[in-house]
C-alpha cells in the first residue's frame, strides 16, 4: 500500500502503527521528538521498501537500531530533500547502529549523521555503494570510531562473512551491524541490482528484486512504476507523478495539494502530474490542468483588505513578494532600515501594476525608487484628495525616481504631487511628467520648484574617461579634468565601482540613505598640477571579472535658484584580465579494474577566465604496508571508554597530546598553530552546522493544531 503524502510521527511512539501497511511512503518520513524511552522491539514494518522523499530521525529516545523497524527499506529516492539530505539522523541519543541492512540505494541527495553520541558502525558502511557521490555526506559528532570497536560478522572467529571495499585508502569489511553484512552485487551485474542469491535483476529494477531479469519483480524501480511493471518512461496517456510512478489524466485531475482550492488541483506539464505550473508558466485558464508560458514574469494578483498597504519596513514589504499586480494603494514610509533598497527590490521588484495610487512620504531611507523595478502602470482607480495618484512628500534623501532611459511608466488617471524632496532635481520630475503622460495635468503648485532639489547638484556636466588599463586584479583609469566656472569650487572626485556581470546597473542600485550601498567608493584628491589628468588605481580586484565604474566631481558651485552645479561620468564597464584558476574541487578516484582508474572532479570555484582544458597527472606509489600489518584482534588496548557527548569540535585524545613534531627538532612539543585557511574553514564549518540546525528546528517545531 502507498502511504503519504509525508508521514510525521512525533511525541507518541505508538503513532508508528500508521506505517503498518505501507510498502511505499510517497513523501517523507519523520520520526522525531519522542522523549520517553520506549521498547521498540514490538514494532516492525517489513513491508516498507521505499521512501520517495527523505527519512529524518531526530531525538527519539530509546531507539537503538533502525534495522528492526525497517528491515526491508531498500530505496530512499530523495525526490524532495531535507536541506540537501535524503537521510538525516540527528541527536539520536540511544542509537547504537543504523542497521538498515537492506538499504541499497539513495537515488538523490546526501546523508547527514550528526550528534548521535552512542552511534557506531559508521566507518564500516561503504556509502559509495548506496549513493552516487559521497563528497557531500556529513558524518560528524558521533561516537569516535576508536571507542566503538566495530566488528563485522565472523571477524572475531576469523571467518569473515562480509565483503571488503576500499574507503579512504582503507581496505576493510563492510557491514551494518555485528551480524549484518552490507550487501554487494556481483561485478557482472554492473550498475544493476541483484537478488539475495546474487542473480542480476532487470535493468529497470533499483535496489533489489525477488526474481532475476524480471521487470515485474523489482523491489523498487530505477525510473517509473506503472501497473505492476518498472518502465523506463511513462507510457502514452500517463504522466510522471512524485518522481516514481505513472498516473493517468483522471487520477491527476482528481487530486489536490494540502493548501489548494478545488479549482487549483494538480496540473499536467511536460509529461508530469505536478502540484503547480513550474516557474515561468501559468495555468491556461482558472479551471485548466495545463500550463502555458508566461509573457514576462507570471502574474500574481495581490489585494490589500484595507485598500491601502503601508510599507514601513522590510517585514511589511515581504507580504508583496512575487506580486505583479497590486489591487489597492501603496503608501511607502521607510524612515530607516538596513540594506533597505535591495530588500525592497527583493520583495516589491516584480510589481508591474498598482490599481490605486502610490504615495511616498517621510521615506528618508530612500535614495531612489528603482526598487520598484518593474512598475509600468499606475491606474489611479482610487486617488488621494486633490486627485493625486502619485504623491511624493518630504523624502530627505530621494535623488532619483527611476532610470528614465530604461523605464516606461504610465499613470492612467490622476495627477502627480512633489514637495520637500531637497535632493530630487526638478528636471527629474519634469522627465517623469513626459514619460508617464501626466504633462499638463499638474497645476502650478503640484511640483514645487523651490523645495525640490534645493540641496542637490542638479545641473550636471559630463565627465569623460581618457584612459583605462587592466591587469588580472587591477584597473587604472583617468578622466578629463573638470573645470567648473570657478575652479576653486572643485573639491575632489569620488570613484564608484562594483562587480557587474551584466551591463545593466544604475547609479542608485542597492543604495539607500542609511549607509548601504552596493558601490565601493574611493575619494580622489585633485592633482596639484592643473594640467595633470586625475586618475586612480583600483586594486584587489578579482581576475576575469567585469566591473562597472563611474566618477563624480564634488563641487560647491551654485547656479540659478541656488541649485548646485555638478559633474559625473557615464557608467564604464571594464573587465580585468584572466588569471590562473583555483584548484579543481572534489577530486575523487576509484578503480574499476586492475588497469584503470576513474577520476572525477568538479570545476574550480574561481575559474578566473574561460576554462579550456584540464591537466591530469598521476604517478605510481608504493603499496601501504600498514594495510597488511593491522590486525584488529591483537591491537593495543582499546582506550578507556568515554561516553561521547555529541559535540564535534574536538577529537578526544587519551594520550599525551604533546607528540607532534614541529620544525626540525625531535621530541614532544606543542601542536603547530592552525593556519588562517584552517581557522577560516573551521569557522565556515561551525556556521554551516548552525544554519542546518536552525533549518531543522524551524522545519520541525510547529504550533500545536488548535
Amino acid at each position: 500500500e502507498i502511504c503519504g503524502p509525508g508521514i510525521d510521527i512525533r511525541n507518541d511512539y505508538q503513532q508508528l502503527k500508521r506505517l503498518e501497511n505501507c510498502t511505499v511512503i510517497e513523501g517523507y518520513l519523520h520520526i522525531l521528538l519522542i522523549s520517553k524511552a520506549e521498547d521498540y522491539r514490538s514494532y516492525r514494518f517489513p513491508k516498507l521498501t521505499v521512501i520517495t522523499e527523505y527519512l529524518l530521525l531526530f531525538r527519539v529516545a530509546g531507539l537503538e537500531s533502525l534495522g528492526d523497524l525497517f528491515p526491508n527499506l531498500t530505496v530512499i529516492r530523495g525526490w524532495k530533500l531535507f536541506y540537501n539530505y535524503a537521510l538525516v539522523i540527528f541527536e539520536m541519543t540511544n542509537l547504537k547502529d543504523i542497521g538498515l541492512y537492506n538499504l541499497r540505494n539513495i537515488t538523490r541527495g546526501a546523508i547527514r549523521i550528526e550528534k548521535n553520541a552512542d552511534l557506531c558502525y559508521l566507518s564500516t558502511v561503504d556509502w559509495s555503494l548506496i549513493l552516487d557521490a559521497v563528497s557531500n555526506n556529513y558524518i560528524v559528532g558521533n561516537k569516535p570510531p576508536k571507542e566503538c570497536g566495530d566488528l563485522c560478522p565472523g571477524t572475531m572467529e576469523e571467518k569473515p562473512m562480509c565483503e571488503k571495499t576500499t574507503i579512504n585508502n582503507e581496505y576493510n569489511y563492510r557491514c551494518w551491524t555485528t551480524n549484518r553484512c552490507q550487501k554487494m552485487c556481483p561485478s557482472t551485474c554492473g550498475k544493476r541490482a541483484c537478488t539475495e542469491n546474487n542473480e542480476c535483476c532487470h535493468p529497470e529494477c533499483l535496489g533489489s528484486c525477488s526474481a532475476p531479469d524480471n521487470d515485474t519483480a523489482c523491489v523498487a524501480c530505477r525510473h517509473y512504476y506503472y501497473a505492476g511493471v518498472c518502465v523506463p518512461a511513462c507510457p502514452p496517456n500517463t504522466y510522471r507523478f512524485e518522481g516514481w510512478r505513472c498516473v493517468d489524466r483522471d487520477f491527476c485531475a482528481n487530486i489536490l495539494s494540502a493548501e489548494s482550492s478545488d479549482s487549483e488541483g494538480f496540473v499536467i506539464h511536460d509529461g508530469e502530474c505536478m502540484q503547480e505550473c513550474p516557474s515561468g508558466f501559468i495555468r491556461n485558464g482558472s479551471q485548466s490542468m495545463y500550463c502555458i508560458p508566461c509573457e514576462g514574469p507570471c502574474p500574481k494578483v495581490c489585494e490589500e483588505e484595507k485598500k491601502t498597504k503601508t510599507i514601513d519596513s522590510v517585514t511589511s514589504a515581504q507580504m508583496l513578494q512575487g506580486c505583479t499586480i497590486f489591487k489597492g494603494n501603496l503608501l511607502i514610509n521607510i524612515r530607516r532600515g538596513n540594506n533597505i533598497a535591495s530588500e525592497l527590490e527583493n520583495f516589491m521588484g516584480l510589481i508591474e501594476v498598482v490599481t490605486g495610487y502610490v504615495k511616498i512620504r517621510h521615506s528618508h531611507a530612500l535614495v531612489s525608487l528603482s526598487f520598484l523595478k518593474n512598475l509600468r502602470l499606475i491606474l489611479g482607480e482610487e486617488q488621494l484628495e486633490g486627485n493625486y495618484s502619485f504623491y511624493v512628500l518630504d523624502n530627505q534623501n530621494l535623488q532619483q525616481l527611476w532610470d528614465w532611459d530604461h523605464r516606461n511608466l504610465t499613470i492612467k488617471a490622476g495627477k502627480m504631487y512633489f514637495a520637500f524632496n531637497p535632493k530630487l532635481c526638478v528636471s527629474e520630475i519634469y522627465r517623469m511628467e513626459e514619460v508617464t503622460g501626466t504633462k499638463g495635468r499638474q497645476s502650478k503648485g503640484d511640483i514645487n520648484t523651490r523645495n525640490n532639489g534645493e540641496r542637490a547638484s542638479c545641473e550636471s556636466d559630463v565627465l569623460h574617461f581618457t584612459s583605462t588599463t587592466t591587469s588580472k586584479n587591477r584597473i587604472i583609469i583617468t578622466w578629463h579634468r573638470y573645470r567648473p566656472p570657478d575652479y576653486r569650487d572643485l573639491i575632489s572626485f569620488t570613484v564608484y565601482y562594483k562587480e557587474a556581470p551584466f551591463k545593466n546597473v544604475t547609479e542608485y542600485d542597492g543604495q539607500d540613505a542609511c549607509g548601504s550601498n552596493s558601490w565601493n567608493m574611493v575619494d580622489v584628491d585633485l592633482p596639484p598640477n592643473k594640467d595633470v589628468e586625475p586618475g586612480i588605481l583600483l586594486h584587489g580586484l578579482k581576475p576575469w571579472t567585469q566591473y562597472a565604474v563611474y566618477v563624480k566631481a564634488v563641487t560647491l558651485t551654485m547656479v540659478e535658484n541656488d541649485h548646485i552645479r555638478g559633474a559625473k561620468s557615464e557608467i564604464l564597464y571594464i573587465r580585468t584580465n584572466a588569471s590562473v584558476p583555483s584548484i579543481p574541487l572534489d577530486v575523487l578516484s576509484a578503480s574499476n579494474s586492475s588497469s584503470q582508474l576513474i577520476v572525477k572532479w568538479n570545476p574550480p570555484s574561481l575559474p578566473n577566465g574561460n576554462l579550456s582544458y584540464y591537466i591530469v597527472r598521476w604517478q605510481r606509489q608504493p603499496q601501504d604496508g600498514y594495510l597488511y600489518r593491522h590486525n584488529y584482534c591483537s591491537k593495543d588496548k582499546i582506550p578507556i571508554r568515554k561516553y561521547a557527548d555529541g559535540t564535534i569540535d574536538i577529537e578526544e585524545v587519551t594520550e599525551n597530546p604533546k607528540t607532534e613534531v614541529c620544525g626540525g627538532e625531535k621530541g614532544p612539543c606543542c601542536a603547530c598553530p592552525k593556519t588562517e585557511a584552517e581557522k577560516q574553514a573551521e569557522k565556515e564549518e561551525a556556521e554551516y552546522r548552525k544554519v542546518f540546525e536552525n533549518f531543522l528546528h524551524n522545519s520541525i517545531f510547529v504550533p500545536r493544531p488548535e
Epitope: I2, F251, N254, I255, L256, D262
Partner: antibody
Amino acid sequence: QVQLVQSGAEVKKPGASVKVSCKASGYAFTDYYMNWVRQAPGQGLEWMGNINPNNGGTNYNQKFKDRVTMTTDTSTSTAYMELRSLRSDDTAVYYCARWILYYGRSKWYFDVWGRGTLVTVSS
Amino acid sequence: DIVMTQSPLSLPVTPGEPASISCRSSQSIVQSNGDTYLEWYLQKPGQSPQLLIYRVSNRFSGVPDRFSGSGSGTDFTLKISRVEAEDVGVYYCFQGSHVPYTFGQGTKLEIK
C-alpha cells in the same frame, strides 16, 4: 477508453448467494478504489462498500457487513462483490463505480460507473 | 448514519426556466480539515448515474455551466439556471465525508 464492464443479470432464490463481477479497462486498476452501489426497483441509490485493490482492504456499510464480501483480482483488473443469504428485498441493480485511491486531499467522486447488473431474488 | 434529505421529491419545470433542488444532512459533513465531500449525481432514465458537481460547488468536466452547486455545513443546493429537455432524470445528492456514505432519496425533474 476507461470503462467498467459488469457481468450479466442473475436470478437467485432466497438464501442463495450471488457474485457480481466488474472488469476495469483503460486505467491502472490499483490507482482507484472500487465501490459498489445498489438501486432497488423504483428506489434510490445505496452505497454498499468499497475495496482497495492493492491490499484487499475493505470498507463496508454496516447494513451489509455480515453478508457481503468484496474482492479483487489485480491480474485481470476485476472486482467482485458477493452477497450471501439473499432476500427478496435484495432485488436491485448493482453498480460498480471507481473512486480515486489517494491518501492526500482529493476530489473523491464516482467518476466512472458500470452499466449495472440486475439481480432478481425470487422463489 | 447521516441521513440526506432532498426536497422537492418531484420538480416539474418549463424549459428555459430555472430549477433548484435542496439537500439537507442530518449532521455536518464538513471534515476536520475543512473539506466537504458533497456531490450531485444525475441518473437519466435507463442509465447509470453521472457526476455533475463535486465538493459542493465544483462542476465536473464536461458538465454545462448552467449547473451550479452551493451551500455549507448541512444545507446544500443544486441550481439549474435554464432547464433543457436533456436535463430530465433523477438528481441525487451524496455525502462522502463519513462512513457509511449516503445518498439523498432523489428528486425527479420532469418537463412540464
